[in-house]
Interface confidence: low
């Protein structure tokens, strides 16, 4: 289930969720009207000060790079 | 019926402890988060802190951090609140509520609340 | 003090309408969910609406939630006398030190 995730045990849970695509602590794009946390807000406050899942942490991914065309 | 169950009054001196139980029952007690927030007499609500019984992880506002602690047992879906160093300002109402930490509802579900009186 | 500032106290007679204020910052309710409750004489706080402007199944439509900015307003139609209570408005704040923070609590008499 959701827990809290602080520290090194969030640069950890970030780098297996994002792989090579990366990810940044910053706001992340796309964020909707709808989300519990405040929209200016990185994932420090939404992830360590408060419970935080997956889908929460996929949302701090880099997006996905597009193909180098040939 | 969905509800948070507090325990009784408790009158302590100032320097002691005090712990307060919050037993909750018709829902799942590991999908909400318990806050607790006091109320002195006459006075407005204050947020103490949370806790995510799942995990057990908590988060204390500022002004009890070092004096309070929330703990929780999932086999009897109760949460726990332990003020330490008592003082006659910590004479209040103290309410544990539930609030999902999935998504935002605001806490919809409020203890009776606990009488706790310092004084010495 | 407050980090949230309503109004100490309201009044209208019954069947009226009135609002009450909320006024924070950018590090609480501009960015933030707003709560509502209302809390009657003697009893625990009770949710009225959440997310800004949600009620919660049982709440009359009488009662309304909106937010601007810095500021939120919970509106009451249809003044009835049970409606007597205290009002708190409540939401998160992001600044340094983070949590839930309540405002000071509005007093709302019935008059008549």
């Known amino acids: 289930g959701p827990e809290t995730l602080c520290g090194a045990e969030l640069v950890d849970a970030l780098q297996f969720v994002c792989g090579d695509r990366g990810f940044y602590f910053n706001k992340p794009t796309g964020y909707g009207s709808s989300s519990r946390r405040a929209p200016q807000t990185g994932i420090v406050d939404e992830c360590c000060f408060r419970s935080c899942d997956l889908r929460r942490l996929e949302m701090y991914c880099a997006p996905l790079k597009p193909a180098k065309s040939a | 019926q969905v509800q948070l169950v507090q325990s009784g009054a408790e009158v302590k001196k100032p320097g002691a402890s005090v712990k307060v139980s919050c037993k909750a029952s018709?829902?799942?007690?590991?999908?909400?988060?318990i806050n607790w927030v006091r109320q002195a007499t006459g006075q407005g609500l204050e947020w103490m802190g949370w806790m995510n019984p799942n995990s057990g992880n908590t988060g204390y506002a500022q002004k009890f951090q070092g004096r309070v602690t929330m703990t929780r047992n999932t086999s009897i879906s109760t949460a726990y609140m332990e003020l330490s160093s008592l003082r006659s300002e910590d004479t209040a109402v103290y309410y544990c509520?539930?609030?999902?930490?999935?998504?935002?509802?605001?806490?919809?579900?409020w203890g009776q609340g606990t009488t706790v009186t310092v004084s010495s | 003090q407050s980090v949230l500032t309503q109004p100490p106290s309201v009044s209208a007679a019954p069947g009226q309408k009135v609002t009450i204020s909320c006024s924070g910052s950018s590090s609480n309710i501009e960015n933030n969910h707003v709560s509502w409750y209302q809390q009657l004489p003697g009893t625990a706080p009770k949710l009225l609406i959440y997310d800004n402007n949600k009620r919660p199944s049982g709440i009359p439509d009488r009662f309304s939630g909106s937010k601007s900015g810095t500021s939120a307003t919970l509106g009451i139609t249809g003044l009835q006398t049970g409606d007597e209570a205290d009002y708190y408005c409540e939401t998160w704040d992001t600044s340094l030190s983070a949590g839930r923070v309540f405002g000071g609590g509005t007093k709302l008499t019935v008059l008549g």
């Open positions: 509520a539930r609030d999902p930490y999935y998504y935002y509802y605001g806490m919809d579900v």
């Open positions: 018709g829902y799942t007690f590991t999908s909400y988060d």
